[in-house]
Interface confidence: low
């Protein structure tokens, strides 16, 4: 009887062979059958499952001139770049007249050098700080034993001896390279070499040494930097803002910070050109030849109030009999703090100086004692903050009031019976 027509007789005359090889290998499985009549489509099974997207080709050769004669059918399954997922039992399958025929199995196995699933990665670490590196490899054949190398020197005497998938490094003091070797019965594969760059540790104990209205002196303790000396430290200051929300871990301020570099040692820096009576946040990082440390957390600091940098402006002083009317305007120069008020001093040629605290008003009427015959009366005004008095104005002579000159009504201020204090006159 013709092949393929009886249930007990398989049409297959050639079954798939076996392939065993390393990852990436290209190979071909073949099966051959002889059938009578129209050739069937050959399907491939892997571990009993039909391969829907198999890279197979089918060749059909007639053995006679009539379509009903026998045909030789050859199906070739190409495996390109052998992977672990390709391994298993392979068979050909055909449907012939309501009956299914399956070839004898062939086997595809993977056996070669170890294959890395995970390799050590480049990273930066702070000096003397523990970290872990990972390496993972597989066969087949198993087992796969790992051997870690640091700067090309093995960290154990044999594969599988010592740390395996995870290498715990208790700390480094110099930039080092790490790799791992994976060993199995077929040989050795070496991973990529990871460079672990040793950076300085984050500086510690950032603190204020002294404060001036427009400058802050800060100091810090440098962290360890391994065998690499620190080349410099960088300090950043940024204006604080209630809405800014610089938290301990927030990486960057919302505006361009004021950046200063300090040569080291000493681990100290004077930050100038700051605003008085202003909150700032500062942080520091130190750099070696290998790169910069991480920044410290932001430290809130504040410049103190200063005294006003200039005297009150546009002072005028007029006299009418026993009364003197003085008024002025706020200093144009920076106040360096919160203006608390003004001090006024007046003095005649042969009379003691009189000092008065005017408060925040910018005008005052003085009630002069005596008959008003004091000669060469002059007035000075200074603004003050919580930090103290600003510079005094130049002495302004008291001018006689001329009829027609407006003189508003002011609250009279009696001079104190004794001066509040005295300072060297101009």
């Amino acid at each position: 009887a013709p092949r393929g027509t009886q249930a007990e007789e398989s049409p297959f005359v050639g079954n798939p062979g076996n392939i065993t090889g390393a990852r990436g290998l290209t190979g071909t499985l073949r099966c051959q059958l002889q059938v009578q009549g129209e050739p069937p489509e050959v399907h491939w099974l892997r571990d009993g499952q039909i391969l829907e997207l198999a890279d197979s080709t089918q060749t059909q050769v007639p053995l006679g001139e009539d379509e009903q004669d026998d045909w030789i059918v050859v199906s070739q399954l190409r495996i390109t770049s052998l992977q672990l997922s390709d391994t298993g039992q392979y068979q050909c399958l055909v449907f012939l007249g309501h009956q299914t025929f399956v070839s004898q199995p062939g086997y595809v196995g993977l056996e070669g050098l170890p294959y890395f699933l995970e390799e050590p990665e480049d990273r930066t670490v702070a000096a003397n700080t523990p970290f872990n590196l990972s390496c993972q490899a597989q066969g087949p054949p198993e087992p796969v034993d790992l051997l870690w190398l640091q700067d090309a020197v093995p960290l154990a005497t044999a594969p599988g001896h010592g740390p395996q998938r995870s290498l715990h490094v208790p700390g480094l003091n110099k930039t080092s390279s790490f790799s791992c070797e994976a060993h199995n019965a077929k040989g050795v594969t070496t991973s990529r070499t990871a460079t672990i760059t040793v950076l300085p540790q984050q500086p510690r104990n950032l603190h204020l040494v002294s404060r001036q209205p427009t400058e802050l002196e800060v100091a810090w303790t440098p962290g360890l930097s391994g065998i690499y000396p620190l080349t410099h430290c960088t300090l950043q200051a940024v204006l604080s803002d209630d809405g800014m929300g610089i938290q301990a871990g927030e990486p960057d301020p919302p505006e361009e910070p004021l950046t200063s570099q300090a040569s080291v040692p000493p681990h100290q820096l004077r930050l100038g050109s700051l605003h008085p009576h202003t909150p700032y946040h500062i942080r520091v990082a130190c750099t070696s030849s290998q790169g910069p440390s991480s920044w410290t957390h932001w430290l809130p600091v504040e410049t103190p109030e200063g005294v006003p940098l200039g005297p009150p402006e546009n002072i005028s002083a007029t006299r009418n009999g026993s009364q003197a009317f003085v008024h002025w305007q706020e200093p144009r120069a920076p106040l360096q703090g919160t203006l608390l008020g003004y001090r006024l001093a007046y003095q005649g040629q042969d009379t003691p100086e009189v000092l008065m605290d005017i408060g925040l008003r910018q005008e005052v009427t003085l009630e002069l004692q005596g008959d008003g015959s004091v000669s060469n009366l002059t007035v000075c005004v200074a603004a003050y903050t919580a930090a103290g008095d600003g510079p005094w104005s130049l002495p302004v002579p008291l001018e006689a009031w001329r009829p027609g000159q407006a003189q508003p009504v002011h609250q009279l201020v009696k001079e104190p019976s004794t001066p509040a204090f005295s300072w060297p006159w101009w």
């Epitope: 044999a158 001896h161 010592g162 740390p163 715990h168």
Partner: antibody
Amino acid sequence: EVKLVESGGGLVQPGGSLKLSCATSGFTFSDYYMYWVRQTPEKRLEWVAYISNGGGSTYYPDTVKGRFTMSRDNAKNTLYLQMSRLKSEDTAMYYCARLSFYAMDYWGQGTSVTVSS
Amino acid sequence: DIVMTQSHKFMSTSVGDRVSITCKASQDVTTAVAWYQQKPGQSPKLLIYWASTRHTGVPDRFTGSGSGTDYTLTISSVQAEDLALYYCQQHYRIPFTFGSGTKLEIK
């Protein structure tokens, strides 16, 4: 039975050289990493060198690096330690040892090296 | 280098007693510790590796334990033939280093 037998020790002057051998039997020599370990007169154990099973990789601590060379002949199942520029602190009993997967599982009986003028 | 410290140079015990020999590593060696026994006039012999795994043929009165930096070799019932020097060794990092040894004396 695993056997390791060292030979070649003796008295040598400082600056001199000596070559130790370790003949092995009872196991597949080419499958194992091997060591030399020494024991000082004060009974301290110091690891001196190791060699990979194929002989392609050797490693030495700083105390002997550049002066000692370890080698092996897998065809003869023999291990060697060439020692040069010897110092008095190299005086010790020298053992060869086999590395199992995790530790030095078999040691020879040792050969004594004395460096003295 | 990793330093292995055996704080007791000598330990005196009696036959049948339980004795523990300790060893401390200068850093975590993740149980990669071996113990060796050296009897007078003999070469060292491996007792324990990977902190607690007994080598072939080692009597079960010898047990190893520990993790991190602290390791112990315990002899549950000392026999006269256990008179020896005992060394610990780390096989975690090259260079491999040994402890200075503990001499077990039988009263």
